[in-house]
C-alpha cells in the first residue's frame, strides 16, 4: 500500500458525504446503494463512520461530470480516466468525481460504480495507489465478480496504518496476494501461452516471458473477465492458438483474450464420467495430439485430434508416473520433460527414461 506524502488523513472519525448529482445510467437508489456499500468497505475495518447529508457542505462531496467539470482536472470521454478523488483536506479535499462519459452499472457491464467508488473513497481517506495487483487501490480497474466483495489485505493494512482498526470486522477474511517466494507455495495450474508461461494461484497468475526472471503478477480477471476468479487446470493447444481452462465441471476454450463461442462446456463432453467433479491438472503434447487430464489419483488421456478419450483410461497416477505421489496440482511439459507439481514440490520427469530425474521446490519455476 501507499499513503499520500505528508500522510494526509482526516483528524476526525465521523465523516459526512453528499451525492450532489446522479448519473442517468442507474436509478437514484442504485447509485445511493453503491456509494453506501463503498463507504462500508472502509468503515468495516476502521473506526470511521460515514453519514450522508442531503444538502449543504459535506466532507466528501460526490458528483458526476464530463470533460472540464470545474476542478482543472478534466475527464477524457469514454474509457481512460474513470474518476478521481482528492486526498483529505478542506474545500476540494476528499471530494470524488465520476466521469459521466462512462457507462456506470451495478453489474459487470460498463464500469461497476461500487468498485470504482470504493477505490476512489480510498483516495478520499488518504490512500494513494498500491503496487499490489490484488489491491483495491491498484490503479487498473478489474471487475472482480458477483460474489461478496472482500477488501484485500493490502488495503486493510494501508487504511489501518492511518486510522487504526475498528472494533469488530464483520468480514475478517481479507485475501492476501500470493508471495512467489513463499517456501510453502503450491500452484493451481500452469500453461504456456504463445511462448510465455502462465502460472495460476488463487485469483492471480504470474506471467513469465522466456529468458526473463521477473514474473509479472496479474488478476486472472484482468486478462479474462468472463472466467471465474480461480481455476483448476489449463493447457495450450499451440497449433490451434487456443488454451483450455478448467474450473469445476466446466471448461473454456480461449483464443488469446477471447472465449470461443459455445463455451463453457461440461467436462463430461470430453468423455469423463459424471462422478468427476473437477480436473486438477492438464498437459497437452503437441507431437502426439494427446492431452493428459488429472483428477484425484487418476489420469485420463484425451485425443485432441479425434476428440475422444483414449481406451484403457483412467489409470492410476502412481502406476503411470511412479514417485510423483497420488495427486497432481499443476503440470506442464518442456523439452521432453514433464513437470509435476504436488504441494510445495515439483518433480522433473523424463518422458524418454520414464522416471523422476529431479525434485525441486514448486516456486523454482518462478526463479525463487
Amino acid at each position: 500500500y501507499n499513503v499520500f506524502p505528508r500522510t494526509l488523513k482526516w483528524s476526525k472519525m465521523n465523516l459526512t458525504y453528499r451525492i450532489v448529482n446522479y448519473t442517468p445510467d442507474m436509478t437514484h437508489s442504485e447509485v445511493e446503494k453503491a456509494f453506501k456499500k463503498a463507504f462500508k468497505v472502509w468503515s468495516d475495518v476502521t473506526p470511521l463512520n460515514f453519514t450522508r447529508l442531503h444538502d449543504g457542505i459535506a466532507d466528501i462531496m460526490i458528483s458526476f461530470g464530463i470533460k472540464e467539470h470545474g476542478d482543472f482536472y478534466p475527464f477524457d470521454g469514454p474509457s481512460g480516466l474513470l474518476a478521481h478523488a482528492f486526498p483529505p483536506g478542506p474545500n476540494y479535499g476528499g471530494d470524488a468525481h465520476f466521469d459521466d462519459d462512462e457507462t456506470w452499472t451495478s453489474s459487470s457491464k460498463g464500469y461497476n460504480l461500487f468498485l470504482v467508488a470504493a477505490h476512489e473513497f480510498g483516495h478520499s481517506l488518504g490512500l494513494d495507489h498500491s503496487k499490489d495487483p490484488g489491491a483495491l487501490m491498484f490503479p487498473i480497474y478489474t471487475y472482480t465478480g458477483k460474489s461478496h466483495f472482500m477488501l484485500p489485505d493490502d488495503d486493510v493494512q494501508g487504511i489501518q496504518s492511518l486510522y487504526g482498526p475498528g472494533d469488530e470486522d464483520p468480514n475478517p477474511k481479507h485475501p492476501k496476494t500470493p508471495d512467489k517466494c513463499d517456501p510453502s507455495l503450491s500452484l493451481d495450474a500452469i500453461t504456456s501461452l504463445r511462448g510465455e508461461t502462465m502460472i495460476f494461484k488463487d485469483r492471480f497468475f504470474w506471467r513469465l516471458h522466456p529468458q526473463q526472471v521477473d514474473a509479472e503478477l496479474f488478476l486472472t480477471k484482468s486478462f479474462w473477465p468472463e472466467l471465474p476468479n480461480r481455476i483448476d487446470a489449463a493447457y495450450e493447444h499451440p497449433s490451434h492458438d487456443l488454451i483450455f481452462i478448467f474450473r469445476g465441471r466446466k471448461f473454456w476454450a480461449l483464443n488469446g483474450y477471447d472465449i470461443l463461442e459455445g463455451y463453457p462446456k461440461k467436462i463430461s463432453e470430453l468423455g469423463l464420467p459424471k462422478e468427476v467433479k473437477k480436473i486438477s491438472a492438464a498437459v497437452h503434447f503437441e507431437d502426439t495430439g494427446k492431452t493428459l487430464l488429472f483428477s484425484g489419483n487418476q489420469v485420463w488421456r484425451y485425443d485432441d485430434t479425434n476428440h475422444i478419450m483414449d481406451k484403457d483410461y483412467p489409470r492410476l497416477i502412481e502406476e503411470d508416473f511412479p514417485g510423483i505421489g497420488d495427486k497432481v496440482d499443476a503440470v506442464y511439459e518442456k523439452n521432453g520433460y514433464i513437470y509435476f507439481f504436488n504441494g510445495p514440490i515439483q518433480f522433473e520427469y523424463s518422458i524418454w527414461s520414464n522416471r523422476i530425474v529431479r525434485v525441486m521446490p514448486a516456486n523454482s519455476i518462478l526463479w525463487c
Epitope: 496479474f218 484482468s222 486478462f223 473477465p225 483464443n255 488469446g256 483474450y257 477471447d258 470461443l260 463461442e261
Partner: nanobody
Framework: EVQLVESEGGSVQAGGSLRLSCAAS????????MNWYRQAPGKQREFVAG???????NYAVSVRGRFTISRDNAEGTGYLQMNSLKPEDTAVYYC????????WGLGTQVTVSS
C-alpha cells in the same frame, strides 16, 4: 458489426521500421480485443500481437521487443509499430477484433528486403 481496414503496408529494408494502423467502423471497437496476425507465402496464418480491452499486451516470441501494439478507443484505431524489421517478417498482415471468431480486415502486404 465491426468493419476493419488496414493501412497500406509497404516495402522496407531490413532493420527499418513501419507502422500499420487498423481503422474500425462501428462504435463497439472498444469492447473487443484487438490483434494482428500475419501469413507468409506457403505458411499458416500466425499470431503476431494482441491488446486486450483493458490494454494488456501479448506478443509472439519472434516479435517481442521489436513490435509494439497499441489502440485508441476514442478514434476506433489499432496500431502495430514494427521496428528492426527482418526479411522473415515479410507477410500479409491482418488486423483482427475479437479473436479467431471475431472480425477481420482484408490484410496488407509488408515486404522486408535484405
Amino acid at each position: 458489426e465491426v468493419q476493419l481496414v488496414e493501412s497500406e503496408g509497404g516495402s522496407v529494408q531490413a532493420g527499418g521500421s513501419l507502422r500499420l494502423s487498423c481503422a474500425a467502423s462501428g462504435s463497439t471497437f472498444s469492447r473487443y480485443s484487438m490483434n494482428w496476425y500475419r501469413q507468409a507465402p506457403g505458411k499458416q496464418r500466425e499470431f503476431v500481437a494482441g491488446i486486450s480491452v483493458g490494454r494488456i499486451t501479448n506478443y509472439a516470441v519472434s516479435v517481442r521487443g521489436r513490435f509494439t501494439i497499441s489502440r485508441d478507443n476514442a478514434e476506433g484505431t489499432g496500431y502495430l509499430q514494427m521496428n528492426s524489421l527482418k526479411p522473415e517478417d515479410t507477410a500479409v498482415y491482418y488486423c483482427n477484433a475479437g479473436g479467431l471468431q471475431g472480425y477481420w480486415g482484408l490484410g496488407t502486404q509488408v515486404t522486408v528486403s535484405s
